[in-house]
């Protein structure tokens, strides 16, 4: 059982109050988290409540005002960024965000020091990327998908590239596709340690077809969006790295780095790049058919003034039973020799565990082992390593932080954080400081999430960063729903799942089931975690039972459950929670009569198959945003997990897997079908092809569009979104209004 | 161009009072802690005090010798920064530099200096 | 008090040589340390601070190193405008006190 926040008795019950639609919509019981922005080893800046940004040194206790409020009000600034000399910041305004990570803005710089805006080559207008280099107060940044240089802020800039187009060639900042499904930022330009060099990606979408789809905006015409997106089995986009030397950037250009032979004979993808040194840099290239990787190490060859990745460096990294990693490929976290590294991978059991590499990947040596993953390594000192996981207790949706000590053998291996704070944090994240001599520990729950700053030495904790006392006494007068996390043993299958329950909740009645269901590959929805949200107002408020499964194709239990959905989308995800259904009606308080399922993006696709399922375990359901056919989706995402539409690859699988094809199958059921017509991600072209199909097949159904909303459904959408979606179930379970 | 300018200086009798000013440009002065040094004929240089911007508290802190004599205090609105010194000693003759700390822990500006002679 | 421990109190050197000069804390005081140069009936100017990082438009002959106690300034080769009086101080906390100082005289 998983305990949330401490109830008052009973006596005192007639004053609790139940979590109303207007809560979740306004935010009323939203938590606050605090992520150091470190800036040294003992020191690091915030943004303070009236919004002055503020230095904190841990070690003198000292807080010192860097820029004043007045200072980021005069140009709007939402955000900034410190040169690490200290010399300069950058205020950042105008957001205009475009796609889940990029967005452009106008950049200010203001010279601490005296206190004045820079004048003189400002920057131009909008940036799509900018960013201090590492040492110093060298500015990188992307303009018009070109890449631009600055020695310092007030000098004129040295361009760097020249045949950036606008939806053809992107220098510095990733494509759609890189962006969404592969590099997960908004940049694709790496800055040497030291800032000697600049590392960047060229991406060429000259012959990716193009999605287009309408903007209606106020205008007499609707716009027409156009983006290079290339979906299952398109054209691809080629992708050049280059290097160049920041110090004397005219002097020979940039410098391409070679891809490795046995990557380039086919279609490829560049992964990621992480420096080692100023001098040495590593990078990760995968097949098209992402079941091999490969990680290679280059050095930079100074009589000729170029970069030589031999193959004594190159690490091959390949899946037999699925795709090459978890979701991504994991990174390399280098140790202090600048050769050998730290890898999360699959072990022979089919674990992904830390591995360390020092000649070669068949020699790595397994730092952590059993039935359960390491999740992210996030620092390497010279004597610790710090990785998260879920060992602690055998729960697959905890994160706990743990130390091994690499620098005595054999290596020790402590639990930094399973019994600070057992109870209420039982999933935990970590920012370190400059050698990690600080952190910070953020907890997300299940109790109300908690931040807070520890040495890096003894672990001690040194001060609580912020603790949402002001959530802690909002919560106290409301009815919030219990919550269980337990599992389902089923043909040698473990299906965890998260139950949320209204606060009287007695066994012995009989209550509607939603189902919310994600269920993507390498994704996992039931976890350890705080929340107050939508499904946590229809168990307060409206009585529902809310269940959420992790079945096959989720992460972090093993490659047996991960890979199971391998080539095979929308078959074993939806047959598990479809049984995990038939486990909860076995329980005795569902009343069978009223169980729903819902589900965005993934878990739209998800629930539009299980509704199409034909087992009459549903009365209705809601797909928000769904995938409906694995063809209209993009092609490093779809391919990873469902190979190739091709007849000599798996053409018929995602033929057999679209929702269309189950149109007749929604004649029973209540169904509610919902996207935004400018859905970048997830076409509207998905949601427009199941309306067809059911339109052809005389099915009735329900839908809502939003006009100009994207995947995210944000501002008044969500409220209109929720409200409607609300209105449907309650219909649906017979609930008055 | 950041400029720090002391005055008030001069020749005060043992136990008389004086009140040196550091008029600031160039930065911005309301986030600045700023600092007292001095320095007596032919010796070292001899930290005095400092106070920190209003924003981080605006409190203050001195050396030994003259803690409880001296009081250091500001007005932003005009850009400048005292010293206010009771109880002169004929010890306390010096050269007195302001200075701003910057927060990378450095005495980065300072001013010419403004001497004081404290003698019968 | 932090005591600032600074050696030697002079030095006779010639325009070409190497010179060295050391600070000792009382207390350990990690990287909060500067070194200052001072000419006669000037202000003092900062070279060094946090230990090893050249101040703008100090030349590359001066460097800086140590942390925790035992600090020390190096001038790799002496030039004529070098002739002055350097002072160690600590950063970490007030009073910020300095070394008594190095007199650089010409040999």
């Known amino acids: 059982i998983v305990l949330r926040p401490s109830r008052v008795h009973n006596s005192e019950e007639n004053t609790m109050r139940a979590l109303t639609l207007k809560d979740i919509l306004n935010g009323t019981f939203s938590y606050k988290t605090f992520f150091p922005n470190w800036i040294s080893g003992q020191e690091y800046l915030h943004q303070s409540a009236d919004n002055n940004i503020v230095l904190y040194n841990i070690e003198t206790g000292q807080s010192y005002t860097i820029l004043s409020n007045r200072t980021m009000k005069s140009v709007n600034a939402s955000n900034y960024g410190l040169s690490p000399d200290r010399q300069f910041v950058y205020l950042e305004s105008d957001y205009s965000k475009l796609w889940r990570y990029s967005y452009t803005a106008t950049y200010y710089i203001y010279d601490l020091s005296n206190g004045e805006f820079v004048r003189g080559n400002e920057l131009p207008r909008p940036i799509q990327y900018l960013c201090w280099s590492p040492v110093g107060s060298k500015l990188a940044y992307v303009y018009q998908n070109n890449i631009y240089l600055k020695q310092r802020p007030g000098d004129p800039p040295f361009q760097i590239t020249f045949n950036g187009r606008e939806n053809k060639i992107f220098n510095g900042i990733p494509d759609w596709v890189y962006e969404e499904e592969m590099l997960a930022t908004k940049y694709a330009l790496w800055w040497s340690p030291n800032g000697k060099f600049l590392a960047y990606a060229e991406f060429n979408d000259t012959d990716i077809p193009v999605i287009a789809y309408s903007y209606y905006g106020d205008e007499q015409y609707p716009r027409t969006i156009n983006i290079p997106y290339p979906k299952a089995g398109a054209k691809n986009p080629v992708v050049r790295i280059f290097i160049i030397d920041t110090t004397y950037p005219a002097y020979v250009g940039p410098q391409e780095v070679p891809v490795p032979a046995m990557i380039a004979s086919s279609d490829y993808y560049f992964s990621w790049l992480t420096w080692v040194t100023d001098e040495r840099v590593c990078l990760q290239w995968l097949k098209r058919v992402q079941n091999v990787s490969v990680l290679s190490i280059c050095d930079f060859r100074e009589d000729w003034q170029t970069w030589d990745c031999p193959k004594t460096q190159e690490h091959i990294e390949e899946s037999r039973t699925g795709w090459a990693g978890g979701f991504f490929v994991s990174t390399p976290v280098f140790s202090y020799d600048a050769i050998s590294y730290y890898k999360i991978f699959s072990d022979k059991d089919g674990y992904k565990h830390i591995h360390y590499i020092k000649d070669t990947v068949e020699n790595a040596i397994q730092i952590t082992s059993g039935k359960w993953e390491a999740i992210n390594i996030f620092r390497v000192t010279q004597d610790s390593l710090f990785y998260s996981s879920n060992e602690f207790e055998e729960y697959p949706g905890r994160r706990n932080i743990y130390r091994i000590s690499i620098g005595s053998y054999p290596p020790s291996k402590k639990c930094v954080t399973c019994h600070l704070r057992k109870e209420r944090c039982q999933y935990y994240t970590a920012s370190f400081s400059d050698y990690a001599k600080y952190y910070a520990l953020v907890c997300y729950g299940p109790g109300i999430p908690i931040s807070t700053l520890h040495d890096g030495r003894t672990d001690q904790e040194i001060k609580i960063l912020e603790e949402n006392k002001e959530l802690e006494n909002a919560l106290k007068n409301i009815q919030l729903p219990k919550e269980e996390i337990k599992k389902l043993e089923v043909d040698e299958i473990t299906l965890w799942y998260k139950m949320i329950l209204p606060p009287q909740f007695d066994r012995s009645k009989k209550y509607p089931l939603l189902i919310q269901v994600y269920g993507g590959p390498c994704s996992q929805s039931v976890r350890s975690v705080f929340a107050v949200n939508w499904i946590s107002y229809l168990a307060s408020k409206e009585g529902m039972v809310i269940a959420l499964v992790d079945g096959r194709g989720t992460a972090f239990q093993g490659d047996k459950l991960l890979y199971a959905v391998y080539r095979k989308l929308g078959v074993y995800e939806v047959e598990d929670q479809i049984t995990a259904v038939r486990k909860f009606i076995e329980m005795g308080f569902i009343d069978e009569k009223r169980i729903a399922i819902w589900g965005w993006s993934y878990g739209g696709y998800v629930s539009s198959l299980a509704l199409a399922s034909g087992t009459g375990l549903f009365k209705c359901g809601i797909a928000v945003a769904p995938v409906s056919s694995w063809e209209y989706y993009a092609s490093v995402y779809t391919e990873r997990f469902m190979g190739l539409p091709t007849k000599d690859d798996n053409l018929e699988h995602y033929k057999n897997s679209t929702v269309m094809a189950r149109a007749e199958y929604f004649r029973n059921v209540d169904y509610l079908l919902i996207h935004g017509t400018a859905d970048d991600n997830v076409h509207f072209q998905n949601s427009a092809q199941i309306a067809k199909a059911l339109v052809n097949a005389q099915v009735d159904f329900q839908a809502m569009w939003y006009s100009d909303q994207n995947h995210g459904l944000s501002g008044l959408s969500t409220n209109h979104l929720y409200t409607h979606m609300t209105h449907f179930l309650k219909q649906c379970f017979s609930l008055s209004d | 161009e950041v400029q720090l300018v002391e005055s008030g200086g001069g020749l005060v009798k043992p136990g008389g009072s004086l009140r040196l000013s550091c008029v600031a440009s160039g930065f911005t002065f309301s986030l600045a802690w700023m600092n007292w040094v001095r320095q007596a004929p032919g010796k070292g240089l001899e930290w005095v005090g400092h106070?920190?911007?209003?924003?981080?508290?605006?409190?203050?802190d001195y050396a030994a010798p003259v803690k409880g004599r001296f009081t250091i205090s500001r007005d932003d609105s005009k850009n400048t920064l005292y010293l206010h010194m009771n109880s002169l000693k004929t010890e306390d003759t010096a050269v007195y530099f302001c200075?701003?700390?910057?927060?990378?822990?450095?005495?980065?500006?300072w001013g010419q200096g403004t001497l004081v002679t404290v003698s019968s | 008090d932090i005591q600032m421990t600074q050696s030697p109190s002079s030095l006779s050197a010639s325009v070409g040589d190497r010179v060295t000069i050391t600070c000792r804390a009382s207390q350990s005081i990690n990287s909060y340390f500067n070194w200052y140069q001072q000419k006669p009936g000037k202000a003092p100017k900062l070279l060094i601070y946090?230990?090893?990082g050249l101040q703008s438009g100090v030349p590359s002959r001066f460097s800086g190193s140590g942390s925790g106690t035992d600090f020390t300034l190096t001038i790799s080769s002496l030039q004529p405008e070098d002739f002055a009086t350097y002072y160690c101080?600590?950063?970490?906390?007030?009073?910020?006190?300095f070394g008594q100082g190095t007199n650089l005289e010409i040999k």
């Open positions: 946090a230990a090893s």
């Open positions: 200075s701003r700390f910057y927060w990378n822990y450095v005495l980065d500006y």
């Open positions: 101080q600590q950063s970490y906390s007030p009073p910020y006190t």
């Open positions: 106070i920190k911007s209003r924003a981080d508290g605006g409190s203050t």
